[in-house]
Interface confidence: medium
């Protein structure tokens, strides 16, 4: 009931709580002397459902039969209307429409850890829309029954707050949940289980790893578990991997030897536990242990390449380059590289440890036969040395690969192709494709890149350290024993017209012709490999088309003669540069007047 109901009553039959689809009778009746003054026949009783008028009647009472009420709560209010006055609230009632509880389904219980508490969950079924009380009962050995009630609106979980003990792990427990509301009750099917069925061990803790004699092959994982644990499963993986290695162990008693770990690798380890071979469930995975395995001496051999540069009649510069070992080959932190240089006939040798670099440059006599050996060392030892005999890599003309071409292949890739050398192609033991950014000064500090290709290959895709709009000098070497032949080409992965033209820095007169000198276009403005320069000239103040001379681009060329100018005529000259994508804008303009005699 709502409000004070001083003036009258609202009664509901059969009940304030009804089953969905039922009919209710609502009666509103006035108490004595609570009607309208003067004429009681003027009493007009009105029944509202929420704010909507559903019935009215003149007199002291009103009866209304109501059907089709929705699930939930519906409010009915009775009001009195008298002539020349506002409606007066008499009384009201709430009617609760719902359903009897369905049978709770899938009752299951779990105890987290040997010291945890028993908690059960179930599925309530459809909402009753009424206050429904759930009672969970657990019957166990020694004729004991625990009972807990739940007063939440949506109750599907209860924790007894008690701890089952493993005195008789095979003893049976039976759980049952009963739902009760005003319209009925329903009990779940009983769920019968043993201690071993429902206890889910706590995850293992205090995980440690030990490497005996700092060796990856003698590794033991240790952990702590609850007392009754029989089974463990271990999973481990390199930290950068998504795939786990799994191991199942029985009666491990908190330790297990791992035999297949890789050296110098960070691993993640986790462990889970179970109390019984067939019964119960696995614990959650433990917190991860992350640990790095010890180093082992490097395997594999360094990939070594070199460059020779003529200094003078008696000396040459040797630059050695090598690539880092892969992580799996290095098997540790490379502390230094050992380079040994030896003159093969005289037996003179020098050894040097290089740290922090993967290159080494020295000057040696041009005479004698020289060899180098390079190896990588970590804390456990050194890799096998890579030995190379220093030779003139381009000396054997007949070994030079033919028809070398370089074409752009997608973003930041260049496809290099060639034909085998004229000399017996079967003599080739391997090809080496080398590339470096083209710098007009032939700068030896520019990083060198290379890859090796099998003797039956006639193409290679180069992608390492390739940038768009940069020109690369590409060489293909054919190696055969202690001989080598090479061919070179320029190539770029992406090009466009140069951003500027060459800057003319001088024009000089020589025997009736002129020599034009210019500064190279800065590398970052070349926008790829230059193919040609163009020199333009025309008479000053003339509207005629300029004449031009096109010069094939050569890296070292910075001047060119022109002999078709008329004496004592002032000319304007400028230059442009071209890539395969087009021509640059003009460089600077210079005026010049040839002083020589007229013909």
């Amino acid at each position: 009931k709502i409000d004070a109901c001083k003036r009258g009553d609202v009664t509901v039959k059969p009940s304030h709580v009804i089953l969905l689809g039922s009919t209710v009778n609502i009666t509103c009746s006035l108490k004595p002397r609570q009607g309208c003054f003067h004429y009681s026949r003027r009493n007009k009783l009105i029944l509202y459902k929420f704010d909507r008028r559903i019935n009215f009647h003149h007199g002291h009472s009103l009866n209304s039969q109501v059907t089709g009420l929705p699930l939930g709560t519906t409010l009915f209010v009775c009001k009195l209307a008298c002539i020349n006055s506002d409606e007066i609230q008499i009384c009201g009632a709430e009617i609760f429409v719902g359903v009897a509880p369905e049978q709770p389904q899938n009752l299951s219980c779990i105890q987290k850890g040997e010291q945890g508490t028993v908690a059960c969950t179930w599925e309530r079924g459809r909402d009753t829309h009424l206050y429904t009380e759930y009672t969970l009962q657990l019957s166990g050995p020694k004729n004991l029954t625990w009972q807990k009630q739940c007063k939440d609106i949506y109750c599907d979980y209860l924790d007894f707050g008690i701890n089952l003990t493993p005195e008789s792990p095979e003893s049976n427990f039976t759980a049952k949940v009963t739902a009760v509301n005003s319209l009925g009750s329903s009990s779940s099917l009983p769920s019968t289980f043993t201690f071993l069925d429902i206890v889910r061990p706590l995850p293992p803790w205090d995980i440690r790893i030990k490497f005996q004699k700092a060796s990856v092959s003698r590794c033991t994982l240790y952990w702590r578990d609850e007392g009754l644990v029989l089974l463990n499963r271990l999973r481990y993986r390199p930290s950068n991997s998504r795939l786990w290695n799994m191991v199942n162990v029985t009666k491990a008693k908190g330790r297990h030897d791992l035999l297949d770990l890789k050296p110098f690798t960070e691993y993640e380890f986790q462990i889970s536990s179970k109390l019984h071979l067939y019964k119960g469930s696995w614990s959650d995975w433990s917190e991860s242990l992350r640990a790095q395995t010890p180093e082992e001496e490097p395997t594999g051999m360094l990939d070594v390449w070199y460059m020779k540069r003529h200094i003078d009649y008696s000396r040459q510069q040797i630059s050695l380059f090598w690539k880092n070992l892969s992580v799996s080959e290095a098997r540790g932190k490379i502390l230094h590289y050992q380079v040994t240089l030896q003159e093969l006939t005289g037996g003179k040798a020098m050894t040097q440890n290089i740290t922090g670099h993967t290159s080494w440059t020295t000057v040696i006599p041009r005479t004698g036969n020289w060899a180098v050996a390079v190896s990588a060392a970590n804390s456990k030892g050194s890799s096998l040395p890579t030995r190379i005999n220093i030779m003139n890599l381009c000396e054997a003309g007949l070994l030079a690969p033919r028809q070398v071409s370089a074409n752009s292949e997608g973003m930041d890739n260049i496809l290099v192709t060639w034909q085998p050398p004229r000399k017996d192609p079967s003599a080739v033991q391997e090809y080496v494709v080398e590339w470096r950014e083209l710098h007009p000064g032939g700068d030896t500090q520019v990083p060198l890149n290379w890859l090796r290709s099998r003797p039956y290959n006639v193409s290679a895709l180069i992608s390492e350290n390739i940038k768009s709009y940069i020109c690369y000098e590409i060489r293909v070497y054919a190696l055969s024993g202690d001989q080598g032949g090479c061919s070179s080409i320029l190539g770029n992965s992406k090009h466009k017209a140069p951003l500027s033209g060459p800057h003319i820095n001088a024009i000089t007169e020589e025997k009736g012709s002129i020599l034009i000198s210019w500064n190279s276009i800065p590398v970052q403005e070349q926008m790829g490999c230059l193919l040609h320069y163009r020199i333009y000239w025309k008479e000053r103040d003339s509207n005629s088309q300029p004449q031009l001379c096109e010069i094939p681009y050569r890296v070292s060329q910075n001047s060119h003669p022109i002999n078709s100018l008329q004496p004592r005529v002032t000319y304007v000259l400028w230059m442009t540069a071209l890539t395969a994508a087009g021509e640059s804008s003009h460089g600077n303009e210079r005026e010049f007047c040839l002083q020589g005699k007229a013909n």
Partner: nanobody
Framework: EVQLVESGGGLVQAGGSLKLSCAAS????????MGWFRQAPGKEREFVAA????????VYVDSVKGRFTVSRDNAKNTVYLQMNSLKPEDAAVYYC??????????????????????WGQGTQVTVSS
């Protein structure tokens, strides 16, 4: 130190009812599980019923289930045992006990004497046939 005093025992006919009370003092009552045990002459002390700290979990021995109801009033520091349909075999000295507090690593079923730290002096219940 918790002191427990039982009351409400007496002589009753078979089929009758009694309500035992146990008043606690000297501790934080709401932090203890409370239990009832009984001991008949010449027999071991036997667990009867218990109620957990919050009052919504109860446990009964099967022989009294449906006849006895354990309840508590934390505001009054009192635990009750309502005994209906009493039988001659229910006759015994009834003891009230306060269980040791739950910690993160210690839970209990509260059905064994060793789960309880404090005990009352007992109250006699006699059932005549």
């Amino acid at each position: 130190e918790v002191q427990l005093v039982e009351s409400g025992g007496g002589l009753v006919q078979a089929g009758g009812s009694l309500k035992l009370s146990c008043a606690a003092s000297g501790g934080t009552f709401s932090s203890y599980a409370m239990g009832w045990f009984r001991q008949a002459p010449g027999k071991e002390r036997e667990f009867v019923a218990a109620i957990m700290r919050s009052g919504d979990t109860t446990v009964y021995v099967d022989s009294v289930k449906g006849r006895f109801t354990v309840s508590r009033d934390n505001a009054k520091n009192t635990v009750y045992l309502q005994m209906n349909s009493l039988k001659p075999e229910d006759a015994a000295v009834y003891y009230c006990a306060a269980g040791r507090p739950v910690t993160r690593t210690y839970y209990s079923t509260y059905t064994y004497p060793h789960d309880y730290d404090y005990w009352g002096q007992g109250t006699q219940v006699t059932v005549s046939s």
